[in-house]
Amino acid sequence: SIPWNLERITPPRYRADEYQPPDGGSLVEVYLLDTSIQSDHREIEGRVMVTDFENVPEEDGTRFHRQASKCDSHGTHLAGVVSGRDAGVAKGASMRSLRVLNCQGKGTVSGTLIGLEFIRKSQLVQPVGPLVVLLPLAGGYSRVLNAACQRLARAGVVLVTAAGNFRDDACLYSPASAPEVITVGATNAQDQPVTLGTLGTNFGRCVDLFAPGEDIIGASSDCSTCFVSQSGTSQAAAHVAGIAAMMLSAEPELTLAELRQRLIHFSAKDVINEAWFPEDQRVLTPNLVAALPPSTHGAGWQLFCRTVWSAHSGPTRMATAIARCAPDEELLSCSSFSRSGKRRGERMEAQGGKLVCRAHNAFGGEGVYAIARCCLLPQANCSVHTAPPAEASMGTRVHCHQQGHVLTGCSSHWEVEDLGTHKPPVLRPRGQPNQCVGHREASIHASCCHAPGLECKVKEHGIPAPQGQVTVACEEGWTLTGCSALPGTSHVLGAYAVDNTCVVRSRDVSTTGSTSEEAVTAVAICCRSRHLAQASQELQ
Amino acid sequence: QEDEDGDYEELVLALRSEEDGLAEAPEHGTTATFHRCAKDPWRLPGTYVVVLKEETHLSQSERTARRLQAQAARRGYLTKILHVFHGLLPGFLVKMSGDLLELALKLPHVDYIEEDSSVFAQ
């Protein structure tokens, strides 16, 4: 029968007795930077080319048994998970292996850098189809390793890495913390985060998604027909490398940004038990388990968006946090969140010719997060329209006045320390979808975009008194681009998007003694692209 | 012993090819920074990745590496250039004493220096 992990990543339409999705990634080359491998194993024979690249440190001490089968274990298993004949994800993908880890499973940042450079030079000498680089390794945060990954990603290479096995914030490790890399955490057959000894999978905002990583059957280097189960975030990353190979084989022109958005879009949502993560990391950690798309073609008409959290600002009075989208994504909205509720909102601003989302801490606050909604919107022309604080009782308003521009997101930023002491604004009158409304003491920023066939609508859900959380979701066929709260009073901790749902968090009235007149409304802006839908219909 | 002789030979050549070694001072107002792994047991002191500014050419990387060797030799330190990077990042990998970091950070074209550290199978 099909192993649990392959079943988990397979959409129901392919589930038969055997795992045999269409096109096994045959147009894609996957580079594996790991231990040596047993290339004559029946699972991977003829599929993996061992390059002459080797850069490994000496093993510690003298207690190493350097028989090939002992040194090849980790790499052989991962090669099998990516492209193995029987237990592989992308059975058609060809692989190339580079040895950067010794018999102990230990390597160096410098050896990994030289390996990445080798891949780049090979790509320049002999350009092939799409390339995926699997980095099933982790070290401490490294500026230089992250920089090298960024350069390789900008050269069109898809990098996939393990989040790390240290039950810790993945942002403290490299290459897991590199924004351009697809970072993968591990879950088990029960969709629980994987526990490994006393530790387990890493988590946090630097993780893009999770994938099966416990009790994964794959090639064993003990003999050429042997199989073994292994666990770890390396195994999870190998699944995503395989899925990426399949997607790229079906659509070789996909950019890294498009691939990442598709991986997120087709993942299983909200199946992970978040109680396993530390409380302060739950909101930052994506509740996504990787899966193959139900159809390898025809996803192009979707408007894809993802949520990007910034690093924490820190607690100083003027501290700010910045969330950035990838180079070929559009920032369609910007929001902020603070656990203490002490914040001064957020704004979209230009930085290096690109819009970024900046959140502002307030005096006495423990710090803030900026939350960017990053979308794939071809031929988009987006700008930010700002209205300064109105000071009048009706609140501050701003709308998209340019012809053909639609509202994709609203942000508000204020200088006063505590909006809660000021009278809340009147809610926006209905029937004005292109307008942002906020507190009269706040400046309001509207994200206005023009793109072929782009249409958006505003959806609201309000409750009379804050209950901790208010949500509003976009319906099928629409994508959440903006998420904000009305009003911006101090009991609102912030707003953020989770998949297609806008979440507004506030302090519970029972703990704050707020009055019931302080209604909290979650405001979602839902968009779709008729142009993308038509384009995909014309292709079919 | 063989390795050491090789290093020494390399240093002598470097000394002959460099004049003062201070001809190109780093650009005014830009300070190169030093980085190292936050996890002590994972650190590998004695090996450093010297990362040069983005548009630095291979020839400048090689020249900067030779300059470091020459200046180190003048102070009685042996260094070994293990690899010159180009294609992804400009820079070089050098085996040297940590005492030379201050000197290396002042070299022209240097953006930052990172002490090597371990990575592990996951």
Epitope: E59, D60, G61, R63, F64, H65, R66, S69, K70, C71, S73, H74, L101, C103, Q104, G105, K106, A138, N165, F166, L196, G197, T198, L199, E214, D215, S220, S221, V228, S229, Q230, S231, G232 | K39, D40, P41, W42, S118, F120, A121
Partner: antibody, heavy 123, light 112 residues
Framework: EVQLVESGGGLVKPGGSLRLSCAAS????????MNWVRQAPGKGLEWVSS????????SYADSVKGRFTISRDNAKNSLYLQMNSLRAEDTAVYFC????????????????WGQGTMVTVSS | ESVLTQPPSVSGAPGQRVTISCTGS?????????VHWYQQLPGTAPKLLIS???NRPSGVPDRFSGSKSGTSASLAITGLQAEDEADYYC???????????FGGGTKLTVLG
Amino acid sequence: EVQLVESGGGLVKPGGSLRLSCAASGFTFSSYSMNWVRQAPGKGLEWVSSISSSSSYHSYADSVKGRFTISRDNAKNSLYLQMNSLRAEDTAVYFCARDYDFHSAYHDAFDVWGQGTMVTVSS
Amino acid sequence: ESVLTQPPSVSGAPGQRVTISCTGSSSNIGAGYDVHWYQQLPGTAPKLLISGNSNRPSGVPDRFSGSKSGTSASLAITGLQAEDEADYYCQSYDSSLSGSVFGGGTKLTVLG
């Protein structure tokens, strides 16, 4: 249920040999380093030996080096300790214990232990 | 003699707080390697009590806590209970021995 069960203990004469086994179940055995720890009667715990997940690394306490050999069979989910040239001071309860193989990035705690098997070396 | 040094015994009355120290050197605790603590009740196998200096596995009461500083570590038990009477061991990794090391163990007696 995660479980380790030791077997193979018994009475043996000084200079004799014994092979201990540890059967593992309920977890991905081949991702874990395995260890032998002993406890002489009325004494404390003493680490004896460890083996990495793929058997690439074997480590021994000085007191047993050259006499004991640790091994494992991942296909059988089993750990072994071959004890030769046994001495009276090797008399102890021998426990097997697991720790996840972090490839020397981290040395984890022994989070699961067997119930132990008694080895008596006496003439 | 053990590489890690623990007091042979400590005692306290029910409800009291006791601490057990574990002193190592620059090749184990001082080298940045974590300290783990085990509880061994009479006639049973050791049970993990604290991992990674201060982390409690699920099921371990929050009366038990661990800390580490420099070349030593300590285990604190608050609100002593009769069932806490056991032997307690610290453990770390030693780079010069390339292996694990245990403390000699501390017998905790709950008075009364």
